[in-house]
């Protein structure tokens, strides 16, 4: 009965999911059989939390769009642990939007989830953040500094990296 | 007032090249990205690329990749969109159009005349 | 890279009709979607954003509707400057791809 309840409970929990990811790639947590974290397929994982790269070139509020219908948000990085993780998809040619703006332009920096803009955990390039018509955050490559933020116009098209929390069956 | 004013006809030939200018004034050129956009006579519209003025950044429809470059001026705030390798179904209005607040193209300039024909 | 199927190609009315021009994209839009007029000579003229938002200065008897994939834009009433080309842009991902056009001319 137990085992069949739990059944029960994960199969809806997996139909909540199936419309934007009707695939998932769960591994065991742990030594319990019965807990399983989940990201959706191709999505990668680390810690807590899963990751997708969009390819598609959008304005930073097409790309918070385009990551919240797949029930997720653009990357809030919280350590350069996760930042090293990030950066082993991406591509040195190209940039991405990271869920962090400046909507005012007053050098305001907020993440999309509300997580507290903590000065001592950027990793922004040298020089950078140094335009107040340049109000979204990317991450590129610069040979001379390796990964780096670096401020944008939000409406210059660029890809995108999407987070969610892991789904937990 | 928000005005973009472009260079005039050209006529080129078969493999050349042919740069395009659109002038802004009435509000801060650094600020708003400029789209390129051209229509075949009789035909629709279709959409080339864009740049942001204020650092140079630009992204390209993927069909002019490697024969568009769009630059700008910031000095006379002034937009170029230069096509190379001219071929005849380059003949076409070409028009720049300012991308305002809302993420939509609120200018244009008046078009310019680009005939390609040897 | 989206594609936009504009319908009809083009029609034919008279003043005081009431004309209906839809928009199809091959993916969703998300209402990125913008309606301009175009008469000849002439650059294009934005009428509506966001699908349904009115740009300024745009008389009250043009609207439009629609979500996903599907898009209409109307003219409740039409009036004689209203004879034109009506061409939809989307705008949620690069290239911005443009609708084929509906020639709206006078029967």
């Known amino acids: 009965n137990f085992m069949y309840s739990k059944t029960v409970k994960r199969l809806s929990k997996l139909r909540e999911y199936q419309q934007y990811h009707p695939s998932l790639t769960c591994v065991m947590e742990g030594k319990d059989i019965e807990d399983w974290s989940c990201c959706p397929t191709p999505w990668t994982s680390f810690q807590s939390s899963c990751y997708f790269i969009s390819t598609g070139m959008q304005s930073w509020t097409k790309s918070q769009k385009n990551c919240s219908v797949m029930g997720a948000d653009l990357v809030v990085i919280n350590t350069r642990e996760e930042q090293d993780f990030i950066i082993q998809n991406l591509k040195r040619n190209s940039s991405y939007f990271l869920g962090l703006s400046d909507p005012g332009g007053r050098r305001h920096w907020q993440w999309v989830d509300q997580t507290p803009y903590n000065e001592n955990v950027t990793f922004w390039h040298s020089g950078e953040p140094n335009n107040l018509d340049e109000r979204c955050a990317i991450i590129n490559f610069r040979s001379s500094e390796e990964w780096g933020w670096n401020d944008i116009h939000c409406h210059v098209p660029q890809k995108s990296i999407c987070k969610m929390k892991k789904i937990y069956i | 007032q928000v005005q973009l004013v472009q260079s005039g006809a050209e006529v080129k030939k078969p493999g050349a090249s042919v740069k395009v200018s659109c002038k802004a004034s009435?509000?801060?050129?650094?600020?708003?990205?400029i789209h390129w956009v051209r229509q075949a006579p009789g035909q629709g519209l279709e959409w080339m690329g864009t740049i942001y003025p204020g650092r140079g950044d630009t992204s390209y429809n993927q069909k002019f990749k490697g024969r568009v470059t769009m630059t700008r001026d910031t000095s006379t705030s002034t937009v170029y969109m230069e096509l190379s390798s001219l071929r005849s179904e380059d003949t076409a209005v070409y028009y720049c159009a300012r991308m305002g607040d809302n993420e939509y193209f609120d200018y244009w300039g008046q078009g310019t005349l680009v005939t390609v024909s040897s | 890279d989206i594609q936009m199927t504009q319908s009809p190609s083009s029609l034919s009315a008279s003043v005081g009709d009431r004309v209906t021009i839809t928009c199809r994209a091959s993916?969703?839009?998300?209402?990125?979607l913008a309606w301009y007029q175009q008469k000849p000579g002439k650059a294009p003229k934005l009428l509506l954003y966001d699908a349904e938002t009115l740009a300024e200065g745009v008389p009250s008897r043009f609207s439009g509707s629609g979500s996903g994939t599907d898009y209409t834009l109307t003219i409740s009433s039409l009036q004689p400057e209203d004879f034109a080309t009506y061409y939809c842009?989307?705008?949620?991902?690069?290239?911005?791809?443009f609708g084929g056009g509906t020639k709206v001319e006078i029967k």
């Open positions: 842009q989307h705008f949620w991902s690069t290239p911005y791809t």
């Open positions: 993916g969703n839009i998300h209402n990125y």
């Open positions: 009435g509000y801060t050129f650094t600020s708003y990205l």
